[in-house]
Amino acid sequence: EICGPGIDIRNDYQQLKRLENCTVIEGYLHILLISKAEDYRSYRFPKLTVITEYLLLFRVAGLESLGDLFPNLTVIRGWKLFYNYALVIFEMTNLKDIGLYNLRNITRGAIRIEKNADLCYLSTVDWSLILDAVSNNYIVGNKPPKECGDLCPGTMEEKPMCEKTTINNEYNYRCWTTNRCQKMCPSTCGKRACTENNECCHPECLGSCSAPDNDTACVACRHYYYAGVCVPACPPNTYRFEGWRCVDRDFCANILSAESSDSEGFVIHDGECMQECPSGFIRNGSQSMYCIPCEGPCPKVCEEEKKTKTIDSVTSAQMLQGCTIFKGNLLINIRRGNNIASELENFMGLIEVVTGYVKIRHSHALVSLSFLKNLRLILGEEQLEGNYSFYVLDNQNLQQLWDWDHRNLTIKAGKMYFAFNPKLCVSEIYRMEEVTGTKGRQSKGDINTRNNGERASCESDVLHFTSTTTSKNRIIITWHRYRPPDYRDLISFTVYYKEAPFKNVTEYDGQDACGSNSWNMVDVDLPPNKDVEPGILLHGLKPWTQYAVYVKAVTLTMVENDHIRGAKSEILYIRTNASVPSIPLDVLSASNSSSQLIVKWNPPSLPNGNLSYYIVRWQRQPQDGYLYRHNYCSKDKIPIRKYADGTIDIEEVTENPKTEVCGGEKGPCCACPKTEAEKQAEKEEAEYRKVFENFLHNSIFVPRPE
């Protein structure tokens, strides 16, 4: 029987009974948070052979081996992964061995086995026989191998029963437990699976089979399962489902979901039965099972039950992620927040249409409304008292509505209202009237000319740059000295700059009133000499990178209740010079004949310009005499070389650091201090562990029901 779509067993070990009749778990299997040590010996699920997603074990007290629970688990497909992993064993306090002696294939994803204080038989498993690539495996913080004394079956009696393979230059027996070898197929089978009797399975089988060369006798399928047969692709009029089987249209149409989007059911797209159309596609009609490409961003209609959606935090904005049409009214009331402008853009930036009104009040954290970067239509089907469909009241730091040179916004019905926005220039409001087609709708009191913009320098003069000079990591710019009517009103200049790969940035990008700003800022004092033009040297820049730069004059904003003129420049785009590229990455060389070497590499992470060619240099090296110095047939004469495995746990390094032999006659000496690169790698490693642990906790801990 197929079970699914993912099974979560927690708190009570008796929930394991849910696995009783499962042969395939279509989805994941979580076994976690069972804090009372139980006797699991009476629980055995020999029917279970395949998990299509991943297996996660976390804090299950009393469980000592998985072999008794899942003696026939053969394949974990990894169709969906848990943080890139198909097998996660984390903080299993009593687990002594993994013991999944029939596990032959993890189709996709890596394994993470971490913080299992009692877990042994890890170095005796050759994961390369199970996974395609072992480089992403993370096996850290388990019982130190020295304390394990792992012995494979028959080793003590000097009648070893298991086969040997090489891992990290160590040729050794491979087993899961003290009495279970790791199964290996004859080399004649190549990539194919094999039976218990070492006969090769059909090429479409994965993991194992009950009879040789028979596509109906597979334990699991390499590609897809359909009507009892393993097939390379789904037959006509059937569709891939969950990455492992073929289903017909009727099956797909009859899948019921508990997701909020289920009103329309599953779809068929690109030969697959899936829950929703993929990114960039939309259903071809509301009850259709088929997808067509969207023109531009895909429409997503979002509706608020209470008609008015209040955006007072990032969390409330999150509910609108992906929405393009909002049915209802938006009330924006953002008083504080961290990195608020870019967060709001992330969650509300796709909204194109609001059917009701938009009201922005007491939003002291906002400097601009540019986070609504795709808003093009306010229908005004519902209006505020007084027939307002755009209402902006008491926003202490609001300076810009939108960049009207690049913005088309129509307000179909209703008026606009603006009051008590001290940094919002009236000229900006008048410009909005023109663009939105609301000019003439507003009465005199709707746009208050006294309390809008009274704390801003609204009539801006333009500062002109006079010179720019660049090097690989510096830009020198100068600009005309600004002369307001009264020179005492000019305090200083502020230069704003940031990386800008494209020439599409605006002054208010990523800026909010709570300190977040995507621009770097530098203050420039007035030159004491009146004839010298002000300027700045921007240093520490990246080579061959385009920067956007603009300058603002810092002026006194009030002179006896008159608005005074400010000044700022246009945004200037300027690219630093090219420089030497960083080194090419991942250089690998291999010989494919007695006279040829194949060398491969990846481009440098920092090209610092346009790469035009690579220079490859090589030279002949003398043979290493070290190879001839020892009699390799005499076991005790082989020099002991330690190979770093890159995952040394701090607590596992117990040797005295003064025991390394430094070669020659020097005798013992201290371990070398860690290089900056090693320290950085250790720091990143610790950070990576933390990130994973946070992900794990966030994924599996859910609040208790009330």
Partner: nanobody, 123 residues
Framework: EVQLVESGGGLVQPGGSLRLSCAAS????????MSWFRQAPGKEREFVSA????????RYADSVKGRFTISRDNSKNTLYLQMNSLRAEDTAVYYC????????????????WGQGTLVTVSS
């Protein structure tokens, strides 16, 4: 953990009607696909009907199509089965079942089950 309790079973004459209820507690009710299964004496358990989390989509076994109606009230955490035109072959213990996220047409192993309520159709 989800607890399911069925009610509404009883003795009814052929052609009569009955309404079964299933009260759920323990987790967000709307995040489960809900189903009715039944088991007649000496027979295998069989699927009767299922409903999506929002209550907008349903599925019925051919044997009950047009006679039974499944519904749910997410505000009351309750699943219903309205059974009309009852026949003798509808006699069985009716079980309510819940599965998180989704349910495929071939799914028999639901995550959570009720204890069942007996429906007897007899003259």
């Amino acid at each position: 953990e989800v607890q399911l309790v069925e009610s509404g079973g009883g003795l009814v004459q052929p052609g009569g009607s009955l309404r079964l209820s299933c009260a759920a507690s323990g987790r967000t009710f709307s995040s489960f696909v809900m189903s009715w299964f039944r088991q007649a004496p000496g027979k295998e358990r069989e699927f009767v009907s299922a409903i999506s989390g929002s209550g907008s989509r349903f599925r019925y076994a051919d044997s009950v199509k047009g006679r039974f109606t499944i519904s749910r009230d997410n505000s009351k955490n309750t699943l219903y089965l309205q059974m009309n035109s009852l026949r003798a072959e509808d006699t069985a213990v009716y079980y309510c079942a819940a599965n998180p996220r989704r349910a495929t047409p071939d799914l028999q192993q639901y995550a959570y089950w009720g204890q069942g309520t007996l429906v007897t159709v007899s003259s």
